[in-house]
């Protein structure tokens, strides 16, 4: 009788991560008696994948019933394949021995290749906010894909960016790969509504790239511009001074009025007007009772925006131009603050 052959008909198979892989193996004879074992890799460091006689292999099932007397099919199915399962699998026939079985013949091996999708790209921006005209860096990461070939593109509001560097790791052969890219973006005052997009394309993706996004609203700080103006009011001896705080982002803003360097009132911006570009405007009023002042008054609008050093704008109020009421010692009138469109 011809000597037993172990036939692995598939030289190589490719499987998508998460699917099952069927590794085919048949023998041409029932003799010699002894079990079949499956290994990944060859040589002394090979890994046991399935042992017909003993052991617990929860992800492995046999394709046919190995308890049947004349069974010659020792194919196995491995469930929930991951990139870590890639390698060459050998179906090995052992001859019954005592105390140990003796390896008799091995199949030629089946190379299992695993294709895995990249994870959704994660885009992260700088830890601290930056102001327009500054260059900031964004990073994009995606992991777990195979094969290694992948393309990554950066966009800002649909316009492709060119200033970026990308690495795919590891450089050599691996069961799966990661991509890391850093893009440089120059901020403009109009970027509150802007988005930075990282787009990853891979053979496993059914046509559309995966996208990760970052909103520049989380990165940008647009400092306010200040304008202090004076309007007369109907009541004699009173002047309405307004501080217009324009085009700032984010909303966090505290305003302090100073009269001749002394704090008159501090308020936190509440009811804001939003501009089309996403920045905000705010207006604060100070009603000044001129008769309370003998000399000219220096009114200062001081704004602390988003924890940054305060910026201020001053206005000189000419007291001499107003008639004075004798004996009046009235403190500054109630200051009115409200939101008003510009």
């Amino acid at each position: 009788e011809e000597e037993l052959q172990v036939i692995q008909p598939d030289k190589s198979i490719s499987v998508a991560a998460g699917e099952s892989a069927t590794l085919h193996c048949t023998v041409t004879s029932l003799i010699p008696v002894g079990p079949i074992q499956w290994f990944r890799g060859a040589g002394p460091g090979r890994e046991l994948i399935y042992n017909q006689k003993e052991g617990h292999f929860p992800r492995v099932t046999t394709v046919s019933d190995l308890t049947k007397r004349n069974n010659m099919d020792f194919s196995i199915r491995i469930s929930n394949i991951t990139p870590a399962d890639a390698g060459t699998y050998y179906c090995v026939k052992f001859r019954k021995g005592s105390p140990d079985h003796v390896e008799f013949k091995s199949g030629a091996g089946t190379e299992l290749s695993v294709r895995a999708k990249p994870s959704a790209p994660v885009v992260s921006g700088p830890a601290a906010r930056a102001t327009p005209q500054h260059t900031v860096s964004f990073t994009c990461e995606s992991h777990g894909f195979s094969p290694r070939d992948i393309t990554l593109k950066w966009f800002k509001n649909g316009n492709e960016l060119s200033d970026f560097q990308t690495n795919v790791d590891p450089a050599g052969d691996s069961v799966s790969y990661s991509i890391h890219s850093t893009a440089k973006v120059v901020l403009t005052r109009e970027d509150v509504h802007s988005q930075v997009i990282c787009e990853v394309a891979h053979v496993t993706l059914q046509g559309d790239p995966l996208r990760g996004t970052a909103n520049l609203s989380e990165t940008i700080r647009v400092p306010p511009t200040l304008e202090v103006t004076q309007q007369p009011v109907r009541a004699e001896n009173q002047v309405n001074v307004t501080c217009q705080v324009r085009k700032f982002y984010p909303q966090r803003l505290q305003l302090t009025w100073l009269e001749n360097g002394n704090v008159s009132r501090t308020e936190t911006a509440s009811t804001l007007t939003e501009n089309k570009d996403g920045t905000y405007n705010w207006m604060s009023w100070l009603l000044v009772n001129v008769s309370a002042h003998r000399d000219d008054v220096k009114l200062t609008c001081q704004v602390e925006h988003d924890g940054q050093p305060a910026v201020s704008k001053s206005h000189d109020l000419k007291v001499s131009a107003h008639p004075k009421e004798q004996g009046s010692n009235t403190a500054p009138g109630p200051a009115l603050a409200s939101a008003a469109p510009l």
């Epitope: 070939d149 496993t204 993706l205 059914q206």
Partner: antibody, heavy 116, light 109 residues
């Protein structure tokens, strides 16, 4: 799982024509689908694909002459203005489950003849 | 665009012969190459994908090899049903576009 083309006929130069590809046994929302053509006695030529979410991508030579779109069960190829060189058998095909680099399910083809 | 050059454009062989068809890409396509068989009046049939993986149901006499720019389709022992035209097809992962070779017609000697 299968795909089948329809809509091929004799058309006059300059007129539009729409071909359809009907699928069964799988969902168009899960796979990339492609259009190809083969002029009589010639080789296979790639026209374009449509992604699982409905984004079309075209071969560089198409230049807006063809439009690929899809509904839940059919994929269409609109030929905006027929030319004599468009005479060919048109095939639709589905990419493999492992990736978009090969096509494992092809329709039998539908013949388009352009003549005045 | 990538060009795919298939050779020979036609060949004559006998049943039982070993047949080799080659395909060369104008730039590297790594292993993104498929082989198809087409008979007159029929749709193409996938034989090999990813340069060397045999598609399910395809006889093991068909095999593929190569990577980068040079690829080979081998029929180890030609059978009567194998007389057909064979096409290679590339996919370029950067441009995400497909290109076919011009075809190789395998005829009976």
């Amino acid at each position: 799982q299968s795909v089948e083309e329809s809509g091929g006929r004799l058309g006059q130069p300059g007129t539009p024509l729409t071909l359809s590809c009907t699928v069964s046994g799988f969902s168009l929302s899960s796979y990339v689908m492609g259009w190809f053509r083969q002029a009589p006695g010639k080789g296979l030529e790639y026209i374009g694909i449509i992604s699982s979410s409905g984004s079309p991508y075209y071969a560089s030579w198409v230049n807006g002459r063809f439009t690929i779109s899809k509904t839940s069960t059919t994929m269409d190829l609109k030929m905006n203005s027929l030319r004599s060189e468009d005479t060919a058998t048109y095939f639709c095909a589905r990419v493999g489950p492992l990736g978009v680099d090969y096509f494992n399910i092809w329709g039998p083809g539908t013949l388009v003849t352009v003549s005045s | 665009d990538i060009q795919m050059t298939q050779s020979p454009s036609s060949l004559s062989a006998s049943v039982g012969d070993r047949v080799t068809i080659t395909c060369r890409a104008s730039q590297s396509i790594n292993s993104y190459l498929a082989w198809y068989q087409q008979k007159p009046g029929k749709a193409p049939k996938l034989l090999i994908y990813s340069a060397s993986f045999l598609y399910s149901g395809v006889p093991s006499r068909f095999s593929g090899s190569g990577s980068g720019t040079d690829f080979t389709l081998t029929i180890s022992s030609l059978q009567p049903e194998d007389f057909a035209t064979y096409y290679c097809q590339s996919w370029h992962y950067i441009s995400r576009s497909y290109t076919f070779g011009q075809g190789t017609k395998v005829e009976i000697k």
